[in-house]
């Protein structure tokens, strides 16, 4: 059980206050994290409170600055890059978001030798992205979708491809199912080790459906965007691999790196691109139907100037029962002799491990073992492996840091953070420095979040780079909920929940529950961590009993939980849902008779689904930007756990799992529907459909929707929301405004 | 204020060698990293070589192959083996830190002059 330790006194009752939703709107409560950007094995960046950026050198204790707010805010920068030579900055101005990941910006490069910014062949505006090489002060960058190439700064560019079109071909930078789906960056190309190759992705979308949607702004006239966007089934991109040589581009120019013959069959996916030295690469693919992805390592031919990707060097990862991969397929991590790799898959037992790979798949050495999850592989030196796991004392949503120490036989495991702050820290990500001589850790809970520099030979903590004691000192006088962590055991199914009580919590009176749900495939909602948000303030202020289950298809307890739910979603998540429902009412405090649930994107289809279950559980729900039909969401994720909306595949079932075909269901209970009509991602085009089989079916519910907003409704529509949202619960529950 | 002495310019031919020593009058210069600036008359200052605390080192690509920065920790003093010299490296010579402290006084540099 994880309680937050009340700080409530009798004779200090009177001194504390409960949340305000003003609080959760303002931010009052937020934390702050300390991310170092390493530039050597002892040395880190940061941007000040002030804006000056400084070195910092954990060696000597000392910090100086090297570029003064005075020069970011002559071009209004938000954003800094050092290059490897230390000899340039690049200050980005003008962000423009684009979608997740993506955003165009201006650039500027100041020269810290002479203390100006370079003159001469500027950079054009706005750029799609920009990047320096890993070693001396190259430049990528991509504009208009092509590729350019500066050896330095102030020398004129190189153009590396010239068919780069709007919405059409993308070069070095993904489109919109590839940003999102696949490759979760705003770029798509890499830099070997030493700058010698620039390896790239582009993306064909001529034939790809578009999805086109108003915005409505403020002219006469709203814009209509268009976006090429693969639907389930629908025409995908066409990706090619390409590397160019960057001290010689015009010798032979890009060559094209090929895609191994069993997935060129039919159509594919390329998924990630990992340099092993300058002149090895490795390549993952992967196939439509995505239980099957390929790893090639391929090698520079010197003498022909190609890349030669043999059999022999391809590995296959394949998955029986689901599909391959957790959200992503993992990528490997290269050992020293730069051909062996640590890479993180399945077991026998359906964990993901970690596995050790010399020469086959079929050969691999398995690091790790046992009926948790190993989650992420940080760093692997000459002597140690480190990674996460959610090990420790058997709670899932735990993460804390292990070491494995590799240079010894056999090899010994030591988890550094599972007892530094054990009330405090269970959920850790680590952050390392060069050849991880120095790490931070960066705990997010369940307590205050608090981020340290620690010692990566002796794990001794050196010292802490963010305790947020502003925040821990406005909290003083707030009551907050408690919070507990536990599980049900329900069918042989381990349903693991996360329940936010009122902070005079008493088990004999009777409290409304609102259930909070994602369920996503691979997600997880029950996690150990620190958040002062919406639910915080409704158990706080309101008196709601707030519950988040984790239920089948959520991650890291198996590929039984994980893969329960393949080519059938929205069956057993909201089973889940409801089977802990019933549990929570068993336990004696939950006023039956007034139960919601809420969710967005995909809760926001497992709330719909549970409200149009039948059970009669809940009093009302609201769903935030559903998706309604697998039809209409992006290919890449809806078919990697659905397949393909075809007769002869799986298309009863997209067609039986949409939120429109129970629309007669929603007759009683209290329906509120959200969408930002500029949705990119979850298109509108969803709860237009869910609205229309309602008002068809003659079913009365409300609704609102925001203009011009994307799937996060963000800036003043979030205050909007979350009061809207909050009037529709209190109303439902009958308690007072 | 730590103050950095350069020295060791001088006048060469082409294709002869020369050595820069930098010394810090603080230990800082030991554990942090250091570099190599020079600036050609009428010409920018630019970067040369650089040296991080544990010796990894860099250098701008018109000088690799030709020249080697190195440090002596015990001593407090950052080198500069210059081989192969060219006109083009004429210039005056700097020591600072990698990269530079921003705001502080460059020194007084030492003069390097390639010429036959």
């Known amino acids: 059980i994880v309680l937050r330790p009340s700080r409530v006194h009798n004779s200090e009752e009177n001194t504390m206050r409960a949340l305000t939703l003003k609080d959760i709107l303002n931010g009052t409560f937020s934390y702050k994290t300390f991310f170092p950007n390493w530039i050597s094995g002892q040395e880190y960046l940061h941007q000040s409170a002030d804006n000056n950026i400084v070195l910092y050198n954990i060696e000597t204790g000392q910090s100086y600055t090297i570029l003064s707010n005075r020069t970011m805010k002559s071009v209004n920068a938000s954003n800094y890059g050092l290059s490897p030579d230390r000899q340039f900055v690049y200050l980005e101005s003008d962000y423009s978001k684009l979608w997740r990941y993506s955003y165009t910006a201006t650039y500027y490069i100041y020269d810290l030798s002479n203390g100006e910014f370079v003159r001469g062949n500027e950079l054009p505006r706005p750029i799609q992205y920009l990047c320096w090489s890993p070693v001396g002060s190259k430049l990528a960058y991509v504009y208009q979708n092509n590729i350019y190439l500066k050896q330095r700064p102030g020398d004129p560019p190189f153009q590396i491809t010239f068919n780069g079109r709007e919405n059409k071909i993308f070069n070095g930078i993904p489109d919109w199912v590839y940003e999102e789906e696949m490759l979760a960056t705003k770029y798509a190309l890499w830099w070997s080790p030493n700058g010698k190759f620039l390896a790239y992705a582009e993306f064909n979308d001529t034939d790809i459906p578009v999805i086109a949607y108003s915005y409505y702004g403020d002219e006469q006239y709203p814009r209509t965007i268009n976006i090429p966007y693969p639907k389930a089934g629908a025409k995908n991109p066409v990706v090619r691999i390409f590397i160019i040589d960057t001290t010689y581009p015009a010798y032979v120019g890009p060559q094209e790196v090929p895609v191994p013959a069993m997935i060129a069959s039919s159509d594919y996916y390329f998924s990630w691109l990992t340099w092993v030295t300058d002149e090895r690469v490795c390549l993952q693919w992967l196939k439509r139907v995505q239980n099957v992805s390929v790893l090639s390592i391929c090698d520079f031919r010197e003498d022909w100037q190609t890349w030669d990707c043999p059999k022999t060097q391809e590995h296959i990862e394949e998955s029986r029962t689901g599909w391959a991969g957790g959200f992503f397929v993992s990528t490997p991590v290269f050992s020293y002799d730069a051909i062996s790799y640590y890479k993180i898959f399945s077991d026998k037992d359906g964990y993901k491990h970690i596995h050790y790979i010399k020469d086959t798949v079929e050969n691999a050495i398995q690091i790790t073992s046992g009926k948790w999850e190993a989650i992420n592989i940080f760093r692997v030196t000459q002597d140690s492996l480190f990674y996460s796991s959610n090990e420790f004392e058997e709670y899932p949503g735990r993460r804390n840091i292990y070491r494995i120490s590799i240079g010894s036989y056999p090899p010994s495991k030591k988890c550094v953070t599972c007892h530094l702050r054990k009330e405090r820290c269970q959920y850790y990500t680590a952050s390392f420095s060069d050849y991880a001589k120095y790490y931070a850790l960066v705990c997010y809970g369940p307590g205050i979040p608090i981020s340290t520099l620690h010692d990566g030979r002796t794990d001794q903590e050196i010292k802490i780079l963010e305790e947020n004691k502003e925040l821990e000192n406005a909290l003083k006088n707030i009551q907050l909920p408690k919070e507990e962590i536990k599980k049900l055991e329900v069918d042989e199914i381990t349903l693991w929940y996360k329940m936010i009580l009122p902070p005079q919590f008493d088990r004999s009176k009777k409290y409304p529950l609102l259930i909070q749900v994602y369920g996503g495939p691979c997600s997880q909602s029950v996690r150990s961590v620190f958040a002062v948000n919406w639910i915080s303030y409704l158990a706080s202020k309101e008196g709601m009993v707030i519950a988040l289950v984790d239920g089948r298809g959520t991650a890291f307890q198996g590929d039984k939980l994980l893969y329960a739910v393949y080519r059938k979603l929205g069956v057993y998540e909201v089973e889940d849902q409801i089977t802990a429902v019933r549990k929570f009412i068993e336990m004696g405090f939950i006023d039956e008779k007034r139960i919601a649930i809420w969710g967005w994107s995909y809760g926001g289809y497992v709330s719909s689904l549970a409200l149009a279950s039948g059970t009669g559980l809940f009093k009302c729900g609201i769903a935030v930007a559903p998706v309604s039909s697998w039809e209409y969401y992006a290919s890449v994720y809806t078919e990697r756990f659905m397949g393909l909306p075809t007769k002869d595949d799986n298309l009863e079932h997209y067609k039986n799992s949409t939120v429109m075909a129970r629309a007669e269901y929603f007759r009683n209970v209290d329906y509120l529907l959200i969408h930002g009509t500029a949705d990119d991602n979850v298109h509108f085009q969803n709860s237009a459909q869910i609205a229309k089989a309602l008002v068809n079916a003659q079913v009365d519910f409300q609704a609102m929707w925001y203009s011009d907003q994307n799937h996060g409704l963000s800036g003043l529509s979030t205050n909007h929301l979350y009061t809207h949202m909050t009037h529709f619960l209190k109303q439902c529950f009958s308690l007072s405004d | 204020q730590v103050q950095l002495q350069e020295s060791g310019g001088g006048l060469v031919q082409p294709g002869e060698s020369l050595r820069l020593s930098c010394a810090a009058s603080?230990?800082?210069?030991?554990?942090?990293?250091m570099g190599w600036y020079r600036q050609a008359p009428g010409k920018e200052r630019e970067w040369v070589a650089g040296?991080?605390?544990?010796?990894?080192?860099n250098y701008a690509d018109s000088v690799k192959g030709r020249f080697t920065i190195s440090r002596d920790n015990a001593k407090n003093t950052v080198g500069l083996q210059m081989n192969s010299l060219k006109p083009d490296d004429t210039a005056v010579y700097y020591c600072?830190?990698?990269?530079?402290?921003?705001?502080?006084?460059w020194g007084q540099g030492t003069q390097v002059t390639v010429s036959s």
């Open positions: 040296i991080t605390s544990d010796g990894i080192t």
């Open positions: 600072n830190f990698w990269p530079p402290l921003y705001g502080r006084p």
């Open positions: 603080g230990s800082i210069s030991s554990r942090n990293a």
